[in-house]
C-alpha cells in the first residue's frame, strides 16, 4: 500500500521513541567512526523533519524515499572524506546505488577501542543523570561495533539494559545485582549479532533462495503441525523482514517484524501450540519470544516420505511443473519429521534430492534411477553424527579451555595464514560448542552443534573477506553455504605453508598479565599457542602440550614473585630458549 510520505508512515507506525532509536542504529551502523554527539544531532534533525511530514504529508521533500532522506543526511557529515576515505565517494552516487555503496563499506571489524565497563556507581550516576542519553549511547556503541545487528532485537536488548539499571541502581548491593545481568546481555548480544550476521551473509552472498530454504527447514522443525502453505507464507514474510534489516532498511524491517508477530499470534491455532505465552507479552518481548520458541510436538502420525517423493509415478512431473515448490515441500516434510537434524544437514539432503531428480528425470527410466535416492542420505547423516560424538567425547575429556586449545592447533594447521587474533577468536567460539551442546541428549545435539558452528564459521568468513589471505578459507566460504563446516572439517594440514620466522618479542610477557581476568589470561596463552604453531606447524601434540605447561608454570611462578617484572624478564628468556629446544626451532 503506497503512502504519500514514507517517513510519516513509519513514524506513525513505530512511534517517536522507536523511530529515533532505529534511525540512530541505522546511522551508527553506516558511519561507525562518527562521534555519538554527531549522530544524535543527525537523528534529531531527521525526527523533526519526520514530524513536519506527519503534520502535512504533502510538505516539501516528504515524498522522498527513506534511502534518499537518510543518505542525504549522512552525506552532510563534514569529515566524511577524512574519516572514511573512499566511502565519501558513495555520496556522488544516486539511489539505490548510493545505499548499496554504504552497505559495502560496513566494517565487521571496525578499528574501535574495546568497550571498558566503568565502575557500577559511575554507571548508575550516569543512568540517573540522563537516562535517555545513557540508553542512546548503548544503542550507538553496540550498533557501530555490530553493523549487522538485528535492529528490532537491539531495541529489545536496550529495554532489558534499562530494566537492569532501573532495578539494580536501587539495590543494596548494586554490583552483585547489575554485573551478572550485564554479562548475560553482553554474551547474548554477541550471539545474537553473530546469528544475524549469518542471515545477512546468506542473503547477500547466496541470495534469497538460499535464505528461504534455510527458513523453510527451520520453521518446519519449529512448527511441524502447520501446513506447507502456512509455513510458506511465514517464510515469505520472514525473508522480507531480514532482507530489509540486512539492507539497512531498519524502519521497514521493524514495522514488518511487528506485523509478522501480530499475524503469527492471530493465527497461532494453525501454526503452533507453543506460542500462547509469547503472544501474551508486549511487542518487543513477543517478537523475541516467537523467534526463540521451542519446537512444537510433531503430529501423532506422519507417513514415510517414500510414497510421495520416491514411489509416486508423478515425481518427475511434479518436479518439472514447479521445481522450487516441490523441493520446498520435500524440505518441509523432511524437516518437520526431523527436529533432531541440523538445518544445514536438512539442506544438504534437499540438495542431494534435487541433484538426483535433475539427473534422473532426464534418464530413460527415471524411477529406476532415483529409486535408491534415500540411501544416498546415509553418509550425509552419519558424518555430522560421528563428528559430534567424537568432539563431545574430546570436550568431556579435556574441558572447555583445553578443548579450545585443541581446536586452535587444528585450525591453525589448516589455515595458518589467517591472523592470530582471528584464529583465537574463532577457535575459542568453536570450542564453546562443547559446553553449549554436548550436555544435550542425542536428539538435540546435532541441531545445536552444527547450526552453531555455521554461525561461528561465518564469523571467520566475514573477517577473512575483509583481508583475504588464504585461498582455502575463500574456497570453503564461497563454494557452498551449507557445506562450509564439512569443507573446513575436511581440510588437512596446509603443506604449502612456509613457517613464520621466530620472533622472541612475540613470546615476551610482562607483569601486567598477572592482573588480567582469567579469560584475558587464557587469550594471552592461546595467542602464544597459535604463534607457536605458526612457527612450527609440524609440532606434535605432545611437544605443544609440554611448552604450554611450561608457559603456565612460568606465569604462575612470576605472578607470585616479589619482583614480578624481573622474574618475567629472566625466566622468560629461559622459557623461550627451552621452548625453542623442545620444538627444534
Amino acid at each position: 500500500d503506497a503512502h504519500k510520505s514514507e517517513v510519516a508512515h513509519r513514524f506513525k507506525d513505530l512511534g517517536e521513541e522507536n523511530f529515533k532509536a532505529l534511525v540512530l542504529i541505522a546511522f551508527a551502523q553506516y558511519l561507525q567512526q562518527c562521534p555519538f554527539e554527531d549522530h544524535v544531532k543527525l537523528v534529531n534533525e531527521v525526527t523533526e523533519f519526520a514530524k513536519t511530514c506527519v503534520a502535512d504529508e504533502s510538505a516539501e521533500n516528504c515524498d522522498k524515499s527513506l534511502h534518499t532522506l537518510f543518505g542525504d543526511k549522512l552525506c552532510t557529515v563534514a569529515t566524511l572524506r577524512e574519516t572514511y576515505g573512499e566511502m565519501a565517494d558513495c555520496c556522488a552516487k544516486q539511489e539505490p546505488e548510493r545505499n548499496e555503496c554504504f552497505l559495502q563499506h560496513k566494517d565487521d571489524n571496525p578499528n574501535l577501542p574495546r568497550l571498558v565497563r566503568p565502575e557500577v556507581d559511575v554507571m548508575c550516576t550516569a543512568f540517573h543523570d540522563n537516562e535517555e542519553t545513557f540508553l542512546k549511547k548503548y544503542l550507538y556503541e553496540i550498533a557501530r561495533r555490530h553493523p549487522y545487528f538485528y535492529a528490532p532485537e537491539l531495541l529489545f536488548f536496550a529495554k532489558r539494559y534499562k530494566a537492569a539499571f532501573t532495578e539494580c541502581c536501587q539495590a543494596a548491593d548494586k554490583a552483585a545485582c547489575l554485573l551478572p545481568k550485564l554479562d548475560e546481555l553482553r554474551d547474548e548480544g554477541k550471539a545474537s549479532s553473530a546469528k544475524q550476521r549469518l542471515k545477512c551473509a546468506s542473503l547477500q552472498k547466496f541470495g534469497e533462495r538460499a535464505f528461504k530454504a534455510w527458513a523453510v527447514a527451520r520453521l518446519s522443525q519449529r512448527f511441524p503441525k502447520a501446513e506447507f502453505a502456512e509455513v510458506s507464507k511465514l517464510v515469505t514474510d520472514l525473508t522480507k523482514v531480514h532482507t530489509e534489516c540486512c539492507h539497512g532498511d531498519l524502519l521497514e524491517c521493524a514495522d514488518d517484524r511487528a506485523d509478522l508477530a501480530k499475524y503469527i499470534c492471530e493465527n497461532q491455532d494453525s501454526i503452533s501450540s507453543k506460542l500462547k505465552e509469547c503472544c501474551e507479552k508486549p511487542l518487543l518481548e513477543k517478537s523475541h519470544c516467537i523467534a526463540e520458541v521451542e519446537n512444537d510436538e510433531m503430529p501423532a502420525d506422519l507417513p514415510s516420505l517414500a510414497a510421495d517423493f520416491v514411489e509416486s509415478k508423478d515425481v518427475c512431473k511434479n518436479y518439472a511443473e514447479a521445481k522450487d515448490v516441490f523441493l520446498g515441500m520435500f524440505l518441509y516434510e523432511y524437516a518437520r519429521r526431523h527436529p533432531d537434524y541440523s538445518v544445514v544437514l536438512l539442506l544438504r539432503l534437499a540438495k542431494t534430492y534435487e541433484t538426483t531428480l535433475e539427473k534422473c528425470c532426464a534418464a530413460a527410466d527415471p524411477h529406476e534411477c532415483y529409486a535408491k535416492v534415500f540411501d544416498e542420505f546415509k553418509p550425509l547423516v552419519e558424518e555430522p553424527q560421528n563428528l559430534i560424538k567424537q568432539n563431545c567425547e574430546l570436550f568431556e575429556q579435556l574441558g572447555e579451555y583445553k578443548f579450545q586449545n585443541a581446536l586452535l592447533v587444528r585450525y591453525t594447521k589448516k589455515v595458518p595464514q589467517v591472523s592470530t587474533p582471528t584464529l583465537v577468536e574463532v577457535s575459542r567460539n568453536l570450542g564453546k560448542v562443547g559446553s553449549k551442546c554436548c550436555k544435550h541428549p542425542e536428539a538435540k545435539r546435532m541441531p545445536c552443534a552444527e547450526d552453531y558452528l555455521s554461525v561461528v564459521l561465518n564469523q571467520l568468513c566475514v573477517l577473512h573477506e575483509k583481508t583475504p589471505v588464504s585461498d582455502r578459507v575463500t574456497k570453503c566460504c564461497t563454494e557452498s553455504l551449507v557445506n562450509r563446516r564439512p569443507c573446513f572439517s575436511a581440510l588437512e594440514v596446509d603443506e604449502t605453508y612456509v613457517p613464520k620466522e621466530f620472533n622472541a618479542e612475540t613470546f615476551t610477557f610482562h607483569a601486567d598479565i598477572c592482573t588480567l581476568s582469567e579469560k584475558e589470561r587464557q587469550i594471552k596463552k592461546q595467542t602464544a599457542l597459535v604463534e607457536l604453531v605458526k612457527h612450527k606447524p609440524k609440532a606434535t601434540k605432545e611437544q605443544l602440550k609440554a611448552v604450554m605447561d611450561d608457559f603456565a608454570a612460568f606465569v604462575e611462578k612470576c605472578c607470585k614473585a616479589d619482583d614480578k617484572e624481573t622474574c618475567f624478564a629472566e625466566e622468560g628468556k629461559k622459557l623461550v630458549a627451552a621452548s625453542q629446544a623442545a620444538l627444534g626451532l
Epitope: 501423532a300 517414500a306 534415500f374 536428539a443
Partner: nanobody, 123 residues
Framework: EVQLVESGGGVVQAGGSLRLSCAAS????????MGWFRQAPGKERERVVS????????YYADSVKGRFTISRDNAENTVYLQMNSLKPEDTALYYC????????????????WGQGTLVKVSS
C-alpha cells in the same frame, strides 16, 4: 535401558506363515516409529517395513507388499510382523528397530535395534 526383544522366528516351508513379535522396554513406545529390517547371509541389511507412531501409516518394501503386514499395540509396547506366502528369498535374520524421528524409514534414522530373530524358509 532400552531393549527390543524379537521372537517368533523359526524354520518354515515355502508358502507358509510366521508371526514375529518385538517387545520394547525402556522407552515411551508410542513416541517411536517402529520398523523391521532383515539381513540375508552375505547381503546388506535391508528395510522390510515400518509403521508410524500411532499406527496410522505403514511403509512396505516392494518385495514384501501384499504378503507381509505390520501392526503395533501401543498398550502392550509390542510391534508385530505377520509374514504370509513366505519364499526362500525371505530367509534372513530379522531385526526390530525403533526411530524417534523418521522421514524415510531408512536404517540411519533408527536409534535402537534388537538382536534379531532368524527366519529360514525351505523349499
Amino acid at each position: 535401558e532400552v531393549q527390543l526383544v524379537e521372537s517368533g522366528g523359526g524354520v518354515v516351508q515355502a508358502g507358509g506363515s510366521l508371526r514375529l513379535s518385538c517387545a520394547a522396554s525402556g522407552l515411551t513406545f508410542s513416541s517411536y516409529a517402529m520398523g523391521w529390517f532383515r539381513q540375508a547371509p552375505g547381503k546388506e541389511r535391508e528395510r522390510v517395513v515400518s509403521i508410524s507412531r500411532g499406527g496410522g501409516y505403514t511403509y512396505y518394501a516392494d518385495s514384501v507388499k501384499g504378503r507381509f503386514t505390520i501392526s503395533r499395540d501401543n498398550a502392550e509396547n509390542t510391534v508385530y510382523l505377520q509374514m504370509n506366502s513366505l519364499k526362500p528369498e525371505d530367509t534372513a535374520l530379522y531385526y526390530c528397530a525403533a526411530a524417534r524421528y523418521w522421514a524415510t524409514g531408512s536404517e540411519y534414522e533408527f536409534d535402537y535395534w534388537g538382536q534379531g530373530t532368524l527366519v529360514k524358509v525351505s523349499s
